[in-house]
Amino acid sequence: QGWQAFKNDATEIIPELGEYPEPPPELENNKTMNRAENGGRPPHHPFETKDVSEYSCRELHFTRYVTDGPCRSAKPVTELVCSGQCGPARLLPNAIGRGKWWRPSGPDFRCIPDRYRAQRVQLLCPGGEAPRARKVRLVASCKCKRLTRFHNQSELKDFGTEAARPQKGRKPRPRARSAKANQAELENAY
């Protein structure tokens, strides 16, 4: 809710990783991982499995730089992109070396962000201006959710300032005098 007001405005996507926020299910490379630990089985799920942990969706690891005008984060940030539909973990691609994608015949169960985290990033700006930092809101985990006609795909909430841009958050960094804080930033202490 509150984060909704802070919209993102300046994200630089690392080209090899494709579009954001929803890479197609077939996108796979060494920067992605599939996990079966998130998401619960929605009610009336076609598969009558008692263990809700068996239902999962793909969490793609996604790397990007945070930018603001001519400034760019010293390091790229890594977050998750929730991808594809939900299904039994055993049928997810790469789960057990199988490539089949399970699709329910009933309602649309989507893989959506579940938890977020904020990470402070140091921005490097040309011309030696004062140090700046911003806080970026990143997806920390995904979950399966039954979507209704009231849902849309923009459940990603963020902090930024400009509408209709890829998600990201911003926050300037402290002055050079705060050596310990800067060090923490640079090491992605979050």
Partner: antibody
Framework: QVQLVQSGAEVKKPGASVKVSCKVS????????QHWVRQAPGKGLEWMGW????????EYASKFQGRVTMTEDTSTDTAYMELSSLRSEDTAVYYC???????????WGQGTTVTVSS | DIQMTQSPSSLSASVGDRVTITCRAS??????LNWYQQKPGKAPKLLIY???RLLSGVPSRFSGSGSGTDFTLTISSLQPEDFATYYC?????????FGGGTKVEIK
């Protein structure tokens, strides 16, 4: 909905200290930067400093260095600004503001009037 | 400290007018400039950041331009709700500083 609610007006004597609070709702305070800006009667805006509630980092305007302290209680999502050794020229409306950067002020509190008078 | 000088300090205009407010920095600040609107008795509101980027929800009649030391805020067609005081703010170097404000009044 993002909201910042500040504490009520204060009247102080010269030499005293004042502590203004700012309750943030709508998102966790630790995920933001907290700023303080003041405005003397009929005058413009003056930036006092910012703080990072998550790690306690701060940046104060040199004018206020040594007199101002910005802190936060992340358990209650409340920011505090304490100004000491008050003088008459500190009479102003003090605003808290928040955002995801250290350099722009996305959301503002309603302001707290601090009057310094003997 | 970087001084920010706004001109004019006040102006009178009518609804529908095109209004231009100028902000000049005492040294080069690149494009590190924000604009705020403040109505009497209220807190300021961020309108534009990084010289020309409009905050989400701000009407498109507001625009910003400039670079280096000279910047402008333009309201293409003044509306009744635009009568307020406008402030520029630099974030090129600490301390962040504001201009003295430009009050836009009804003619």
């Amino acid at each position: 909905q993002v909201q910042l609610v500040q504490s009520g007006a204060e009247v102080k004597k010269p030499g005293a200290s004042v502590k203004v609070s700012c309750k943030v709702s709508g998102f966790p305070i630790k995920d933001t930067f907290q700023h303080w800006v003041r405005q003397a009667p009929g005058k413009g805006l003056e930036w006092m400093g910012w703080s990072d509630p998550e790690i306690g980092d701060t940046e104060y305007a040199s004018k206020f260095q040594g007199r101002v302290t910005m802190t936060e209680d992340t358990s209650t999502d409340t920011a505090y600004m304490e100004l000491s050794s008050l003088r008459s020229e500190d009479t102003a409306v003090y605003y808290c503001a928040t955002g995801d950067t250290t350099y722009k002020f996305d959301f503002w509190g309603q302001g707290t009037t601090v009057t310094v008078s003997s | 400290d970087i001084q920010m000088t706004q001109s004019p300090s006040s102006l009178s205009a009518s609804v529908g007018d095109r209004v231009t407010i100028t902000c000049r920095a005492s040294q080069d600040i690149s494009n590190y400039l924000n604009w705020y609107q403040q109505k009497p008795g209220k807190a300021p509101k961020l309108l534009i950041y990084y010289t020309s980027r409009l905050l989400s929800g701000v009407p498109s009649r507001f625009s910003g331009s400039g670079s280096g030391t000279d910047f402008t805020l333009t309201i293409s067609s003044l509306q009744p709700e635009d009568f307020a005081t406008y402030y520029c703010q630099q974030y090129s170097d600490y301390p962040w500083t504001f201009g003295g404000g430009t009050k836009v009044e009804i003619k």
